[in-house]
């Protein structure tokens, strides 16, 4: 069966300075392959978080994700500032063979707010 | 640098238990997923055990399950296994090692020798 | 007995180029590495997630996969490439670490 992606909340409201939790699980693990946060959609998307252990700065994990069976990908942003003001997607990639992973699932996407403190 | 340093094997007779541990350095041991693995002698390696890095979840082949337990002391920087019931064919060279995000071995410590004989 | 199977040996002279191949993984739940073992050492990471080398791995040690099967290719074979080379796997729909039985790389 097709694996789903979840991002349940539509939009967050943050203020600057403060921390947010964008939530994101999915239903299977499987093709094997990572799971990435991107702003933005296309070509100009922006990688945010990637959850195959390089370090990003202000970005971090919620859960255990070395649990062999973790299938939740949300992640904290700290210390939020204007600039990441946008949607944010949660992407499931299949890893390629010798090639680029490819995408094969993303969620509905949640629209990050932030307001002045 | 990355350093794992295993302890705690010896000789010890069927049936009888021991314990391994894996002292662990240069890294942020409490972030990342550690397993260990064995090599009889003149054999390949064998997976025996794994553990997350917070330590709640752990994983074992048919092998050594009900035998053998993974745990870990993160206050500590230290990886343990617990060998029970301990069999001829559990002489080995036990090694930890520590895992990537997708479970695979990056690092290896240099082993502890465990002999099970009468 | 082990889930994956790599040929028990490979001779190759020194400066041609080494390909050892492992099969017997599905490929949507498995991810692969290779480790090298000299006598009386610890294994050494040379490649893990089917392709990716550690910094401190010779550019000469390269990974690949096509459908169910790995390769381990070795460039410019040199006489210190010498040692048992394995296969290992995570399967993810098993949450288990299988090996290969290993490949000694004989150097003519």
């Known amino acids: 069966t097709e694996v789903k992606v979840t991002q349940p909340e539509k939009s967050v409201s943050v203020a600057a300075g403060d921390s947010t939790i964008l939530n994101c699980t999915v239903t299977s693990l499987l093709p094997v392959g990572p799971i990435r946060w991107y702003r933005g959609v296309g070509q100009s998307r922006l990688l945010i978080y990637s959850f195959t252990g390089e370090h990003f700065p202000r970005i971090r994990n919620v859960s255990d994700t070395t649990k062999r069976n973790n299938m939740d990908f949300s992640i904290r942003i700290s210390n939020v500032t204007p600039e990441d003001a946008g949607t944010y997607y949660c992407v499931k990639f299949q890893r390629g063979s010798s090639e680029p992973d490819t995408e094969i699932q993303s969620g509905g996407g949640t629209e990050v707010y932030v307001l002045a403190k | 640098e990355v350093q794992l340093v295993e302890s705690g094997g010896g000789v010890v007779q069927p049936g009888g238990s021991l314990r391994l541990s894996c002292a662990a350095s240069g890294f942020t041991f409490s972030s990342n997923a550690m397993s260990w693995v064995r090599q009889a002698p003149g054999k390949g390696l064998e997976w025996v055990a794994g553990?997350?890095?917070?330590?709640?979840?752990?994983y074992y082949p048919a092998s050594v399950k009900g035998r053998f337990t993974i745990s870990r002391d993160n206050s500590k920087n230290t990886l343990y296994l617990q060998m029970n019931s301990l069999r001829a064919e559990d002489t080995a060279v036990y090694y930890c090692?520590?895992?990537?995000?997708?479970?695979?071995?990056?690092?290896w410590g240099q082993g502890t020798l465990v002999t099970v004989s009468s | 007995s082990y889930e994956l199977t790599q040929p028990p040996s490979v001779s190759v002279s020194p400066g041609q180029t080494a390909r050892i191949t492992c099969s017997g993984g599905?490929?949507?739940?498995?991810?692969y590495a290779w480790y090298q073992q000299k006598p009386g050492q610890a294994p050494v990471t040379l490649i893990y997630s089917d392709d990716k080398r550690p910094s401190n791995i010779p550019e000469r040690f390269s990974g690949s996969s096509s459908g169910t099967t790995v390769t381990l290719t070795i460039s410019g074979v040199q006489a210190e490439d010498e040692a048992d080379y394995y296969c290992?796997?995570?399967?993810?729909?098993?949450?288990?670490?299988?090996f290969g039985g290993g490949t000694k790389l004989t150097v003519l």
């Open positions: 290992g796997g995570y399967d993810q729909s098993s949450y288990t670490n299988p």
């Open positions: 599905s490929y949507s739940s498995y991810y």
């Open positions: 090692a520590r895992e990537t995000w997708n479970h695979l071995f990056d690092y």
């Open positions: 553990i997350s890095a917070g330590g709640s979840d752990t």
